[in-house]
């Protein structure tokens, strides 16, 4: 429908004015703005969303005016490349204007940065921001939107209204509470994670499309669709499918306002089709848009119809097996990929695919041989040891979770991954060592149905939080290899890495060891990030430190850092107990 | 326009056969698991079978197990439901529908009936 209705309008721009609404349409329109010049400040953004705004206005009451009939990128291209400052901020990015629709838009796309140099956001005073919330609501969710997109240039669009939504309700309320900060910081600090953790989902979504092609992430979508809507027929998951592939590969490439558009028909669409689809839809279908979409996305799997067959009667035991496979490969595939996944709600998505990565190279293998049903008969045991494996990962690291907890746990997590790839520098590895530490608390609450689909395709995204940083400034080989080769096999293949023997140790650095009374006033979070900074420099300077040996500098450390702060003149505790503590750790790591 | 064509009914004495055939159109054919339910006079809807979209799994009502064998052929947009040693409460009209163990009314063709008797 999408293609067609397209055709249908002279006006693209006016067509997407009056299906979003002027809100939604400044406000898309804004945050990809903020995702392509991630630098520019906002009364820039601002500026320029109001002459696209004013423009589209046009076209919307003459949709044969002058330039109305231009592509949306061609006109978000044009004003973006009005920016006086483009080459003194952006340097190279300014050549893209220099190149003619689609390669220009390719070229924004391709400047994006996932680790932009910003300064972290800092929150102010509740009754600050009460203040400006009520002097001016509109600019106040629009600085928001901004600051987000800016910082996460691969944020889902759609999504992020809906976050603003909510962060808008959570003023209105909280402003005009008793309490104001108990009522909102809480909201604000659960907005920020969930945030976070959409921007990395989302971020995942957009490496599959972009590295490794349509049908790596077509893939993906079989096997969760299928997994979240047992019920659903094949035609029905591969509609879906193709209608999900659009909407994120159109919200990947910038094309906010289309992907908006076309997630809302989606969301239309499954809830005027929940009959055939999932009997959980019903809750999510009576909602307004943005939650129902949101709702949707996040609902739980259906039940699995009664008395499915066994899948080897199909796809093992048929004699028409290569017939079917020959007749068109990819489809029957995607048959086997929707049977496996509606009977595994208790496997990750990724391990589904890696299942049907076996059987598609043993049926390339067995359909040329001279007794194909022999030789692909036993292909089903080949799946045992790909599920055992991530079933006693998964037991061995929640056991170890249990027995330290979430900080030790991450810590653990630091050493083993510093060792890995020592390459990789400390901001990058003690934020991605402590979001797969965080797979803990997430996931081993859950019973061992939940804990692999829960805890794998979590560690996915956070590997790709490591994979796109690394990719910005390729330090390392081993990450690289284990990025690149198979989306799939990524967990597996830093799982396998052991440590790096070639890494030539770091220069001791004192002043790395060097802390001050300013630690005392930091919140807890960020103390432990202190600490875990340090000890990854600890890794870097002696890789092969024991477990014990580590444990005892960072007990030490954690140590001084209490004695000191409970110090009369902590200033000077740091500077003498620091020193002594310096010399301590040389000594019991041998530096 | 999805379209569901039911024929070979008939009268038939107890302990007989017959095969009754579903043609599909209008819809992907080998894209559904398909099954087949009935209706005897003045009574509800009952399941009777169902095959998976590549047609070597399939599933049986307690009440028909060893007696019905289901089948489809994918190239002819076919589905088939033997039926042996037939009884007298399988008199019913016999429905083909789309989708595997249907929980939820779908639409129905018109039928073809089966009567059992001596």
């Known amino acids: 429908r999408g293609v067609f209705r397209r055709d249908a309008h002279k006006s693209e721009v006016a067509h997407r004015f009056k299906d979003l609404g002027e809100e939604n349409f400044k406000a898309l329109v804004l945050i990809a703005f903020a995702q392509y010049l991630q630098q520019c400040p906002f009364e820039d953004h601002v500026k320029l969303v109001n002459e696209v705004t004013e423009f589209a206005k046009t076209c919307v009451a003459d949709e044969s005016a002058e330039n109305c009939d231009k592509s949306l990128h061609t006109l978000f291209g044009d004003k973006l490349c009005t920016v006086a400052t483009l080459r003194e901020t952006y340097g190279e990015m300014a050549d893209c204007c220099a190149k003619q629709e689609p390669e220009r838009n390719e070229c924004f796309l391709q400047h994006k940065d996932d680790n932009p140099n910003l300064p972290r956001l800092v929150r102010p005073e509740v009754d600050v921001m009460c203040t400006a919330f009520h002097d001016n609501e509109e600019t106040f969710l629009k600085k928001y939107l901004y600051e987000i997109a800016r910082r996460h240039p691969y944020f889902y669009a759609p999504e992020l209204l809906f976050f603003a939504k909510r962060y808008k309700a959570a003023f209105t309320e909280c402003c005009q509470a008793a309490d104001k900060a108990a009522c909102l910081l809480p909201k604000l600090d659960e907005l920020r994670d969930e945030g976070k953790a959409s921007s990395a989902k989302q971020r995942l979504k957009c490496a599959s499309l972009q590295k490794f092609g349509e049908r790596a992430f077509k893939a993906w979508a079989v096997a969760r669709l299928s997994q979240r809507f047992p019920k659903a027929e094949f035609a029905e998951v591969s509609k879906l499918v193709t209608d999900l592939t659009k909407v994120h590969t159109e919200c990947c490439h910038g094309d906010l306002l289309e992907c908006a558009d076309d997630r809302a028909d989606l969301a239309k669409y499954i809830c005027e089709n929940q009959d055939s689809i999932s009997s959980k839809l019903k809750e999510c279908c009576e909602k307004p848009l943005l939650e129902k979409s949101h709702c949707i996305a996040e609902v739980e799997n259906d039940e699995m119809p009664a008395d499915l067959p066994s899948l080897a009667a199909d796809f093992v035991e048929s004699k028409d097996v290569c017939k079917n496979y020959a007749e068109a490969k990819d489809v029957f595939l995607g048959m086997f990929l929707y049977e496996y996944a509606r009977r595994h709600p208790d496997y990750s998505v990724v391990l589904l695919l890696r299942l049907a990565k076996t059987y598609e190279t043993t049926l390339e293998k067995c359909c040329a041989a001279a007794d194909p049903h022999e030789c692909y008969a036993k292909v089903f045991d080949e799946f045992k040891p790909l599920v055992e494996e991530p079933q006693n990962l998964i037991k061995q690291n929640c056991e170890l979770f249990e027995q330290l907890g979430e900080y030790k746990f991450q810590n653990a997590l630091l050493v083993r991954y510093t060792k890995k790839v020592p390459q990789v520098s400390t901001p990058t590895l003690v934020e991605v060592s402590r979001n797969l530490g965080k797979v803990g608390s997430k996931c081993c609450k859950h019973p061992e149905a939940k804990r692999m689909p829960c805890a794998e395709d979590y560690l996915s995204v956070v590997l790709n939080q490591l994979c796109v940083l690394h990719e910005k400034t390729p330090v390392s080989d081993r990450v690289t290899k284990c990025c690149t080769e198979s989306l799939v096999n990524r967990r597996p293949c830093f799982s396998a890495l052991e440590v790096d023997e070639t890494y030539v140790p770091k220069e001791f650095n004192a002043e790395t060891f060097t802390f001050h009374a300013d630690i005392c006033t930091l919140s807890e979070k960020e103390r432990q990030i202190k600490k875990q900074t340090a000890l990854v420099e600890l890794v870097k300077h002696k890789p092969k430190a024991t477990k014990e040996q580590l444990k005892a500098v960072m007990d030490d450390f954690a140590a001084f850092v209490e004695k000191c702060c409970k110090a009369d003149d902590k200033e000077t505790c740091f500077a003498e107990e620091g020193k002594k503590l310096v010399a301590a750790s040389q000594a019991a790591l041998g530096l | 326009e999805v379209q569901l064509q039911e024929s070979g009914g008939g009268l038939v004495e107890p302990g007989g056969s017959l095969r009754l055939s579903c043609v599909a159109s209008g819809f992907t054919f080998q894209h559904y698991a398909m099954s087949w339910v009935r209706q005897a006079p003045g009574k509800g809807l009952e399941w009777v079978s169902s095959?998976?979209?590549?047609?070597?799994?399939?599933s049986y009502a307690d009440s028909v197990k060893g007696r019905f064998t289901m089948s489809r052929d994918n190239a002819k947009n076919t589905l088939y439901l033997q039926l042996n040693s037939l009884k007298s409460e399988d008199t019913a009209m016999y429905y083909c529908v789309r989708g595997w163990h249907p929980d939820v009314p779908r639409p129905l063709g018109q039928g073809t009936l089966v009567t059992v008797s001596s």
């Open positions: 095959i998976s979209m590549v047609g070597g799994g399939t």
